[in-house]
């Protein structure tokens, strides 16, 4: 995934950790926080695998790339990065693997240059609808985010608070229409069973969408029509059985698209005929020669591109009088 990277060479480590009072005087703007490494030349701060329980208050103003990975943050409160003056340069923020289970409304406010945010590998049981928009207004100020990486943020089953995880994530993506400029969205490995139908239509700038390693069974109600800039669509390792005509036509109509469909349990019966015909003609599916049938048993491991219409039959539905118990 596209986590913030750094060419940092000379990192200065800070003094031993001292917890600071909430109302403490902000230190000089360029000192390095406790338990972090800083490179002003690379505009990078790394506070990695240090078991931090909160975001350091004394981040240097020059920071463009901030790594807060492998910590124990638990909760990201409103204004977690709000500083006066603001951290105006911060463009890439990586919070992956920091045991976050709650991200509150306005957690990323006052990061006016934030382009790339990675929250992957955090069990987000409670993601506020206003985590990215910062405001409960129907239309918020546009977020500067261009890349949002949310791979493997699904919490354990017993922590899901009896609500749709898909719905919670989508609510945060759509609130206030703040993410209209989002170009890359990664949602891999989240056990998604479905994709709410309105989500893609409201993210018109998307170039890259990664939905791999989920549990998507169907795309019937998902529209790709508005995603005219979409360049890559990753649907590998889902539970897709077939793509229907409407979906095929929409994908074919996207001018720059590359679709990845490996490792889905394709059902090679009469409903697959249109998809097979389309696969033989289309250039948009990458590695299409690797797609194989999973069902029915007699078709297992057959290559989709090698099938013809005679191979794709459906067992006749018996009239009730002939059905056996």
């Amino acid at each position: 995934s596209s986590s913030p990277t750094s060419s940092a060479s000379s990192f200065s480590s800070s003094a031993p950790f001292l917890a600071s009072a909430v109302s403490a005087q902000p230190p000089l703007p360029d000192q390095c926080p406790a338990l972090c490494e800083c490179s002003e030349a690379a505009r990078t701060v790394k506070c990695v695998n240090r078991n931090l329980t909160e975001v350091p208050t004394d981040l240097p103003a020059y920071v463009r790339n901030l790594f807060l990975t492998g910590n124990q943050l638990a909760v990201l409160p409103a204004g977690a990065f709000a500083r006066r003056p603001p951290l105006a340069e911060l463009a890439a923020l990586n919070l992956s693997g920091s045991r976050l289970d709650e991200v509150r409304a306005g957690a990323f406010e006052h990061l006016p240059s934030l382009r790339q945010l990675d929250l992957s590998h955090n069990p987000l049981a409670d993601l506020s609808p206003f985590a990215f928009s910062g405001s409960n207004a129907s239309v918020s100020a546009p977020s500067p985010l261009v890349e949002l990486i949310l791979n493997h943020i699904v919490p354990p089953e017993d922590e899901r608070q009896n609500r749709s995880f898909e719905g919670m994530v989508v609510a945060a993506l759509l609130a206030g229409r703040a993410l209209q400029g989002l170009r890359r969205l990664e949602l891999a490995s989240n056990h998604f069973l479905y994709l709410p139908r309105d989500v893609l239509a409201q993210l018109p700038s998307l170039r890259h969408l990664d939905l791999s390693n989920n549990s998507l069974v169907s795309l019937t109600y998902v529209s790709f029509r508005n995603l005219t800039h979409l360049e890559s669509l990753h649907l590998e390792d889902n539970a897709l059985k077939v793509l229907h005509n409407g979906t095929l036509a929409e994908l074919q109509g996207l001018p720059h698209i590359r679709v990845f469909l490996d490792n889905n349990p394709w059902v090679c019966d009469c409903h697959m005929a249109d998809m097979v015909t389309w696969l033989k003609e289309t250039e948009v599916v990458q590695g299409k020669d690797r797609l194989t049938c999973a069902y029915p048993e007699k078709m297992r491991n057959r290559v989709l591109l090698e099938l013809n219409s005679a191979d794709l039959d459906c067992d006749p539905i018996l009239p009730p009088s002939l059905q056996t118990s």
């Epitope: 103003a61 951290l87 340069e89 006052h110």
Partner: antibody, heavy 127, light 112 residues
Framework: QVQLQQPGAELVKPGASVKMSCKAS?????SYWITWVKQRPGQGLEW???????????NYNEKFKSKATLTVDTSSSTAYMQLSSLTSEDSAVYNC????????????????????WGQGTSVTVSS | DVLMTQTPLSLPVSLGDQASISCRSS???????????LEWYLQKPGQSPKLLIY???NRFSGVPDRFSGSGSGTDFTLKISRVEAEDLGVYYC?????????FGSGTKLEIK
Amino acid sequence: QVQLQQPGAELVKPGASVKMSCKASGYTFTSYWITWVKQRPGQGLEWIGDIYPGSGRANYNEKFKSKATLTVDTSSSTAYMQLSSLTSEDSAVYNCARYGPLFTTVVDPNSYAMDYWGQGTSVTVSS
Amino acid sequence: DVLMTQTPLSLPVSLGDQASISCRSSQSIVYSNGNTYLEWYLQKPGQSPKLLIYKVSNRFSGVPDRFSGSGSGTDFTLKISRVEAEDLGVYYCFQGSHVPFTFGSGTKLEIK
């Protein structure tokens, strides 16, 4: 429209404390700092400190650290400043102001300032 | 603390004249992210201050274009090209780059 409402005046005795309010309306209270400024009669302005209502985190001018305590009540969109151990030197007008992004330009989202001010609370310390 | 020195303390002008106010900081107020948080505020008699200029030279919304700000590093200037009666009051510069944030001592613009 954005408004910051402050009570007009407070009369307090030397050695006592006073807690003044600044009630915000017309915007998302938790998304902007509240700054407090002191102005003594015929003198200039002094920054006391500020508080971010979203997190409750406050910053203080070292000079006022043992004098002022800043708090917020997000449920009523109200910021408070308590001044303790009052003396005649604390007689002044105290203004609250909103600090945050100025949505006046798309080209520079890094523009922040104190864009709205309360009318001020006049504190008189007298026995 | 960063000391903000304003000159003059008092500026008598005739309506229609140009006025110029200087503000000098005791150290650079360029923040380490490259921004200079230098603002100008006007306080009219009996009122609270109002924002005129932010980040050295940007006019706040609703501020007439006869107001302009300039400068860099430690030296800053506010100019009013043609003074009008509603411009009278005390002008303060303010640095929001280094804690504690500090105001200038103020310049009183008055009619000659």
